[in-house]
Amino acid sequence: ACDTATCVTHRLAGLLSRSGGVVKNNFVPTNVGSKAF
């Protein structure tokens, strides 16, 4: 599994699209990283 920052972004984007743009306050990303690094 992807274990760094961009993966978080992609998962969050998917979550946003599935939830109509609302993210629960208790949403904490899993252990993943960023393509911007």
């Epitope: 760094t4 990303p29 990283g33 393509k35 911007a36 690094f37």
Partner: antibody, heavy 122, light 107 residues
Framework: EVQLVESGGGLVQPGGSLRLSCAAS????????ISWVRQAPGKGLEWVAE??????????HYAEAVKGRFTISRDNAKNSLYLQMNSLRAEDTAVYYC?????????????WGQGTLVTVSS | EIVLTQSPATLSLSPGERATLSCKAS??????VSWYQQKPGQAPRLLIY???NRYLGIPARFSGSGSGTDFTLTISSLEPEDFAVYYC?????????FGQGTKLEIK
């Protein structure tokens, strides 16, 4: 204009402590993930630690070589990043860079400071 | 830890020539690879992210390709300012890691 200014480097004896700072300006600091990356004289780049944004619970990750000795932290109100370095060793001698990055869709951003030199020697 | 192996260690070329730099990962990293350029006394500069995307302001002569474990940075026609050290990095797994670097020098 984006600016990142590291400070706090210097000469320290083995076993000593040092606290590095990175002052940021020109962008929304709290949105960014931040890493410290170091480079020993004449050597390659080595990732040291990362702290995520406030919205990501400011989660931290560390390289094995510094785990338990170094602590990364941030103060979003002061637009500042810190690296507390304890139990310093000769092999920690390096230029330390702060690196800020933001990744959302096409909004990729990546900023480096100019670096601050840490020398561990007796 | 994912090990990135860059080759060659040193590449000697002339301005106008094409440069091809390789980066091989010890494990699959999908496209979570970036390429950096570093000149003496300066901080690294991001060139390519996501294996093939040029960062803001990076000239079109720089391109990246690859996925999985094999990655390539290509500079189509070298300019005098391109002679520097190039590093690949991966951000697919912690710890983030860098390759050992390829020094691109003037022939």
């Amino acid at each position: 204009e984006v600016q990142l200014v590291e400070s706090g480097g210097g000469l320290v004896q083995p076993g000593g402590s040092l606290r590095l700072s990175c002052a940021a300006s020109g962008f929304t600091f709290s949105n960014y993930w931040i890493s410290w990356v170091r480079q020993a004289p004449g050597k390659g780049l080595e990732w040291v630690a990362e702290i995520r944004s406030e919205s990501d619970a400011s989660a931290t990750h560390y390289a094995e070589a510094v785990k338990g000795r170094f602590t990364i932290s941030r103060d979003n109100a002061k637009n500042s990043l810190y690296l507390q370095m304890n139990s310093l060793r000769a092999e920690d001698t390096a230029v330390y860079y702060c690196l800020l990055y933001f990744d959302y869709g096409l909004a990729i951003q990546n900023y480096w400071g100019q670096g601050t030199l840490v020398t561990v020697s007796s | 830890e994912i090990v990135l192996t860059q080759s060659p260690a040193t590449l000697s070329l002339s301005p106008g020539e094409r440069a091809t730099l390789s980066c091989k990962a010890s494990k699959r990293v999908t496209t979570y690879v970036s390429w950096y350029q570093q000149k003496p006394g300066q901080a690294p500069r991001l060139l390519i992210y996501g294996a093939s995307n040029r960062y803001l302001g990076i000239p079109a002569r720089f391109s990246g390709s690859g996925s999985g474990t094999d990655f390539t940075l290509t500079i189509s026609s070298l300019e005098p300012e391109d002679f520097a050290v190039y590093y690949c990095s991966q951000s697919y797994n912690y710890p983030y890691t860098f390759g050992q670097g390829t020094k691109l020098e003037i022939k």
